[in-house]
Amino acid sequence: HSDGIFTDSYSRYRKQMAVKKYLAAVLGKRYKQRVKNK
């Protein structure tokens, strides 16, 4: 996941926010799956 060539603060910020959203979605799915399997 390189997200392009820009290294300015805004590009870095947008990438960081994307990672946070992605991880939240993945962890949320895993949590729901665990609850479902109980």
Epitope: H1, S2, D3, G4, I5, F6, R14
Partner: antibody
Framework: SVEESGGRLVTPGTPLTLTCTAS????????MGWVRQAPGKGLEWIGD?????TTDYASWVNGRFTISRTSTTVTLKMTSLTTEDTATYFC????????WGQGTLVTVSS | AAVLTQTPSPVSAAVGGTVTIKCQSS????????LAWYQQKPGQPPKLLIY???NLASGVPDRFSGSGSGTQFTLTISGVQCDDAATYYC???????????FGGGTEVVVK
Amino acid sequence: SVEESGGRLVTPGTPLTLTCTASGFSLSRYAMGWVRQAPGKGLEWIGDISTYGTTDYASWVNGRFTISRTSTTVTLKMTSLTTEDTATYFCARDYWLSLWGQGTLVTVSS
Amino acid sequence: AAVLTQTPSPVSAAVGGTVTIKCQSSQSVYDNNALAWYQQKPGQPPKLLIYAASNLASGVPDRFSGSGSGTQFTLTISGVQCDDAATYYCLGGYDDAADNAFGGGTEVVVK
């Protein structure tokens, strides 16, 4: 280069999906954004999608548009279209929109 | 959503002269510098000129320069050429991307 496709004449309320493809670089390595321009008007930022598939939209979108991606395409799905959505729709590379396609024209008319 | 207000059109410039276009945001952009400038000619897509307020995009002549911080930004074209006749847009990036928006555009006429 970047190329948009899928624009056509539709009636109000008809859903429409636009597609963005790339040549000369790997689309999967870049965040991609969508921008539109009504005839004779200015540019309007719609939203973008990260390499992780997470999305951000302009506040005015209100859930009517959805951006998604595969390894080779980025799509813009539009619903509840009105005549106000008549515009040329551009796909552009990365958060700074550094490389643009020629655009695809969407005309919404009854 | 943020509102970006640009210098009213048209702005007239003489070949070899200097043009200044201003962009004012209703709220501070991210890190006080998340602002870009684009050039668009009739029938063509926009072209990135400046990003992060003052960074020249790849392949853009250095007669284009950007400055400013927070809510006030400026695009300057020095040694204006006929080829610079176009409409110029600013784009602001914000803490919440839902606020991202373009300015209304400024047309530059070269005489």
